[in-house]
Interface confidence: low
């Protein structure tokens, strides 16, 4: 495939990055589903300033990104380092919280309304970021 | 446009109770943290409580732990103040706001607490 | 708990007049802090949020900045509808607390 040199419409571009940010909810792994479908993945955050950017486009709305620990350790979709990387969690999260009755514990983490992180349940409705890096070679087959 | 629109204040006696309500429209009421905040007449702001959507985390002021109960219908776009127990030091107007940073209020709603 | 200070307490100042008000944090809030206005009678008006990002329909004449312990309100050009009570909040951690607030008024 050929590099994507340009963000696909209706998508943002910042820092080399393209990210698309929905306006409805789906469970994560529906969420994740649909981002994998766009050749993209659930937004991984890296740093302070795309924490800024995120948040300045989402508002105050709960809403998905692409770290999960439903297997145990907390990873990044993208395989970007968890433990040295960004973090930008609330107060006392994540907690793993079991007292919602919905079975389980909280696997998926969720941007809140003031921006920083929470672990939820992974079935919850919320809206999603996804994003897709410029540089990457695109699945669509090169213009003859 | 969003608007909050307290209810259910009014005079009780120390040791009483009463249930503030907050009817929330203009928004997805059930995506977004709400709050209450209070104001004894002539002085400064003071959070009282703060319930996360889907009800998920919920946090009180020491000054009302053990008294006042916080609660959400997402369905009826409503927030609650249960407070029992009531004071002298709780008599303020108590407002509802939304999310962590306030950016919307409603009117506010009287609480007076005498013999 | 975090407490939070203003100053000056109050003020007095004239229309036109660029007036300042400061708040400070006891620890950290990275940029977790918000403004409100609130005139007798009435319920605080959000003015700004995540330190310097403008609410929505406030006056391009209001500005706020800082990050960490330190924060500013700035308005650029008093107006006589500006004349009012001003508080600060941090929302970075629970329990939410408020600044004392600073009082401008007319000279």
């Known amino acids: 495939g050929s590099e994507r040199t340009c963000c696909p419409v209706n998508w943002v571009e910042h820092e080399r990055s393209c990210y698309w940010f929905s306006r409805s909810g789906k469970a994560w792994a529906d969420a994740d589903n649909y981002c994998r479908l766009e050749d993209a993945h659930l937004v991984v955050v890296t740093s302070w300033e795309e924490q800024k950017f995120v948040q300045h486009h989402i508002g105050p709305v709960n809403t998905w990104m692409g770290l999960h620990d439903q297997n145990g350790p907390w990873k990044w979709v993208d395989g970007t380092d968890y433990e040295t990387g960004f973090k930008n969690w609330r107060p006392e999260q994540p907690d793993d919280w079991y007292g919602h009755g919905l079975g389980g514990g909280e696997d998926c983490a969720h941007f809140t309304d003031d921006g920083r992180w929470n672990d939820d349940v992974c079935q919850r409705p919320y809206r999603w970021v996804c994003e897709t890096e410029l540089d990457k070679a695109s699945q669509e087959p090169p213009l003859l | 446009e969003v608007q909050l629109v307290e209810s259910g204040g009014g005079l009780v006696k120390p040791g009483g109770s009463l249930r503030l309500s907050c009817a929330a429209s203009g928004f997805t009421f059930s995506s977004y943290t709400m709050n209450w905040v209070r104001q004894v007449p002539g002085k400064g702001l003071e959070w009282v409580s703060s319930i996360s959507g889907s009800s998920t985390y919920i946090y009180y002021a020491d000054s009302v732990k053990g008294r006042f109960t916080i609660s959400r219908d997402d369905a009826q776009n409503s927030l609650y103040l249960q407070m029992n127990s009531l004071r002298g030091e709780d008599t303020a107007v108590y407002y509802c706001?939304?999310?962590?940073?306030?950016?919307?209020w409603g009117q506010g709603a009287l609480v007076t607490v005498s013999s | 708990d975090i407490q939070m200070t203003q100053s000056p307490s109050s003020l007095s100042a004239s229309v036109g007049d660029r007036v300042t008000i400061t708040c400070r944090a006891s620890q950290g809030i990275n940029n977790y802090l918000a403004w409100f206005q609130q005139k007798p009678g009435k319920a605080p008006k959000s003015l700004i949020n995540a330190a310097s990002s403008l609410q929505s329909g406030v006056p391009s004449r209001f500005s706020g900045s800082g990050s960490g312990t330190d924060f500013t309100l700035a308005i650029s050009s008093l107006q006589p509808e500006d004349f009012a009570t001003y508080y600060c909040q941090q929302y970075y951690s629970y329990p939410f607390t408020f600044g004392p607030g600073t009082k401008v008024d007319i000279k």
């Open positions: 706001a939304r999310v962590t940073s306030f950016d919307y």
